[in-house]
Amino acid sequence: TRDIREPPALKYGIVLDAGSSHTSMFIYKWPADKENDTGIVGQHSSCDVPGGGISSYADNPSGAGQSLVGCLEQALRDVPKERHAGTPLYLGATAGMRLLNLTNPEASTSVLTAVTHTLTQYPFDFRGARILSGQEEGVFGWVTANYLLENFIKYGWVGRWFRPRKGTLGAMDLGGASTQITFETTSPAEDRASEVQLRLYGQHYRVYTHSFLCYGRDQVLQRLLASALQTHSFHPCWPRGFSTHVLLGDVYQSPCTVAQRPQTFNSSARVSLSGSSDPHLCRDLVSGLFSFSSCPFSRCSFNGVFQPPVAGNFIAFSAFFYTVNFLRTSMGLPVATLQQLEAAAVNVCNQTWAQLQARVPGQQAHLADYCAGAMFVQQLLSRGYGFDERAFGGVIFQKKAADTAVGWALGYMLNLTNLIPADPPGLRKGTDFS
């Protein structure tokens, strides 16, 4: 007889990413005997919660919990039954809930209480539902990307762990309500709030991170709409031939549009707004989102926020990817350089409503916003973060790495389950022939 080697036992972890516009559930798995290896944790499955983000349940907190049931039931089937009790379950909420917590902390607490109530009904090892800080969101996204791309440590053929020479990748995340930039830097931080010191696998990393609340795609679109109402009788970023009715109360209810809010306005007033396909005026409107007038540090990105010069290669994911992918795929435009990205944005902004619909059939509801989205991404990267052509050449737009979605969720779980040790593994893996 010969021994049959059983496959190594798998462990699982679940993270609910409660974003501003929707919630996604990610189930991760890894071999139990290789917990400390890098790149060993991967995505097992995922599930999109139907409907809006949990912050949209401010008036109906119990609905926030109930909305998660379908995905949690899927988790019961995706994770083997004997592993349920040992599977950590986390919910992390991001900028949508940060905004709700600013405007209505009681509602924010009620929503988190309601989702906690639902999550505790399941047989997993529930470890809490909380709102992540912008800094955490940025850093965990950076950890995810570099973990998946195996930039922290590598396992050599002689069985020793070693750190690869390739350095780490910066991470840029564009969500619905905020955007994050995170990268390793040698410059000391002039603003302590933007520096994070990490020790991973025995290596020390000095990381710059900043999260800009209200600079997520959905909130940017709201702010541009508010600006268009304030300064024009039309929307320069919308295509000519497109018009819609806008309720003033909807535009000004977000804390992100407070700067454009008139002192007195009728919240139930309806305004008809039409597009004008004007790339130059649209660029001006988008430029108004960024302030460069004052900087209390030696250098800033925008709005007086300290940022060292961007260094190294970057991965740009979430809405960065979707925006650029639309330009590349749906519009067939080159976006390999900053100049091309700007030209692509201008191209989209020049299109009339009829031209856009003919180019991309079946997506009318969203097409009107691609001009503003593209213009914002181009301005944020070039003027906001200071990418020049050379630096932009090192940016890859990608939503997945190693078949796993890039975002803060994996990094968050790796951190909370101690799957990335601070020190390198003590035992050698394999045989040392030296």
Partner: antibody
């Protein structure tokens, strides 16, 4: 052609049980959730719940939880709505509806794209 | 739950008229879908995601709006358009419908 064909009208007495069906054709049954919608006589539409045939997962509107059971049989591409004990207030037209979706910015957005012809359930003593 | 209130509840119009139906949500929603229902028939999808025309729906139907205020417009009413119209939201659980707007012949 995508079609949903529902079982015929039913006349029942209070306290009786009932199971109505919705047979799908023209698409991959397990790729879409199936929802059930109630329309009481002369009234609007109410979402009752749904079934994910791939995972055999049902979710319910709290208003209907415990009152009905939603299930599916993948092998015959059919979804079901059942009652263990009918009440007069269950008298209504019941529709199955396929949950269509499209992807935008990485998120699935849903809508009822195809409906069954409806099953009229009358509960009367 | 999010309440959807349609206005008007009913209206009388003539062939060729421009008709606008509004749908007001009790809380902000991402999108609204519109259905048409004729007596004794199942609802039929007209517009999904606020302004996307469903397959086979004539271009005289259009939708717009955002947040809590949405509209369905029929640019030139045709005889086959006399029916009841429902709005529907899929932003917040449980998914809800408006009470309906009946479009009758004047």
């Amino acid at each position: 052609e995508v079609q949903l064909v529902q079982s015929g009208a039913e006349v029942k007495k209070p306290g009786e049980s009932l199971k109505i069906s919705c047979k799908a054709s023209g698409y991959t049954f397990t790729d879409y959730n199936m929802d059930w919608v109630r329309q009481m006589p002369g009234k609007g539409l109410e979402w009752m719940g749904d079934i994910n045939p791939k995972y055999d997962i049902s979710t319910y509107n709290q208003q209907f939880k415990g009152q009905v059971t939603i299930s599916a049989d993948k092998s015959i591409r059919t979804a079901y709505l059942q009652w263990s004990s009918l009440k007069a207030s269950d008298t209504a037209m019941y529709y199955c509806a396929r949950r269509g979706f499209f992807l935008y910015y990485g998120i699935n957005y849903y809508y009822f794209d195809v409906w069954g012809q409806g099953t009229l359930v009358t509960v009367s003593s | 739950d999010i309440q959807l209130t349609q206005s008007p509840s009913s209206l009388s119009a003539s062939v060729g008229d421009r008709v606008t139906i509004t749908c007001s949500a009790s809380s902000s929603v991402s999108y609204i879908h519109w259905f048409q229902q004729k007596p004794g028939k199942a609802p039929k999808l007209l517009i999904y995601s606020t302004s996307n025309l469903a397959s086979g729906v004539p271009s005289r139907f259009s939708g717009s709006g955002s947040g809590t205020f949405f509209t369905l417009t029929i640019s030139s009413l045709q005889p086959e358009d006399f029916a009841t119209y429902f709005c529907h939201q899929w932003s917040s659980y449980p998914w809800t419908f408006g009470q309906g707007t009946k479009v009758e012949i004047k």
